[in-house]
């Protein structure tokens, strides 16, 4: 019938949408993975930096409270708020110097999540781009296909064609719309 | 458990200059951090600086500039090297160190700063 003769027709450029669209994001996802593996990599000397850095201060934090613990244990007599007046410099230190290595990192850290952001944001652009003149191509195809069909079938198809070309529009514009504000998420973060 | 044995204490004029030296025995797997401390009569038993396994040294404010710290991991021996001492440096020196949480501590020298 004439649903059949549509459907056959239609499917072959359905179905390329599709393939391609999923050729595309499986792209997208490879060179995504390939930008997370090159900014881990330069991240890492940062990250072991912070790490060394971190266990010498606890190190060090360690050494310097063990007088302290050793002349309690031996039974100096000494009242628990003077210890505690005594440890509570040796705490704020370990402290801002554990802060002064946290802005470090941060710091050497802020160029490469910039970087990956600007990265996904151009490839989100050029699939949108992509994505966007593909459509229209098989809105154009779809359109050829359905007008040699109601040559053919005019009366039975033209309330069909009427119906599906504005389904085909605003699929058009809704997975577009969805690129944009996916984007734009991107660009807030 | 590893034993600290500190020696080159005495007495010493304003000015003047000292090195301790604490060597350690037993069983050390590594280099591990060594530590000075002191403690006056009458006085707080205080932390005075430090050697990392890695080298990196940290000191007390009173002694920055004047006291350095050094090692020898061929003899397991820490070195410190006092200079322009003062009356207040005068305390007995402990070498410490801090193993796997257990704390090991030489028995001490005796260094007397005055004129």
């Known amino acids: 019938s004439t649903f059949s003769k549509l459907r056959e027709q239609l499917g072959p450029v359905t179905q390329e949408f599709w393939d391609n669209l999923e050729k595309e994001t499986e792209g997208l996802r490879q060179e995504m993975s390939k930008d997370l593996e090159e900014v881990k990599a330069k991240v890492q000397p940062y990250l072991d930096d912070f790490q060394k850095k971190w266990q010498e201060e606890m190190e060090l934090y360690r050494q310097k409270v063990e007088p302290l613990r050793a002349e309690l244990q031996e039974g100096a007599r000494q009242k628990l708020h003077e210890l505690q007046e005594k440890l509570s410099p040796l705490g704020e230190e370990m402290r801002d110097r554990a802060r002064a290595h946290v802005d470090a990192l941060r710091t050497h850290l802020a160029p490469y999540s910039d970087e990956l952001r600007q990265r996904l944001a151009a490839r989100l652009e050029a699939l949108k781009e992509n994505g966007g003149a593909r459509l229209a191509e098989y809105h154009a195809k779809a359109t050829e296909h359905l007008s040699t069909l109601s040559e053919k079938a005019k009366p039975a198809l033209e309330d069909l064609r009427q119906g599906l070309l504005p389904v085909l529009e605003s699929f058009k514009v809704s997975f577009l719309s969805a690129l944009e504000e996916y984007t734009k998420k991107l660009n807030t973060q | 458990q590893v034993q600290l044995v500190e020696s080159g204490g005495g007495l010493v004029q304003p000015g003047g200059s000292l090195r301790l030296s604490c060597a350690a025995s037993?069983?050390?797997?590594?280099?591990?951090?060594m530590s000075w401390a002191r403690q006056a009569p009458g006085r707080q038993r205080e932390w005075v600086t430090s050697?990392?396994?890695?080298?990196?040294?940290d000191y007390a404010d009173s002694v920055k500039g004047r006291f350095t710290i050094s090692r020898d991991n061929a003899n397991n021996t820490v070195y410190l090297q006092m200079n322009n001492l003062k009356p207040e440096d005068s305390a007995v020196y402990y070498c410490?160190?801090?193993?796997?949480?257990?704390?090991?501590w030489g028995q001490g020298t005796q260094v007397t700063v005055s004129s």
């Open positions: 050697i990392l396994g890695t080298g990196r040294t």
């Open positions: 410490y160190t801090v193993l796997n949480g257990r704390p090991s």
């Open positions: 037993g069983t050390i797997t590594r280099s591990p951090t």
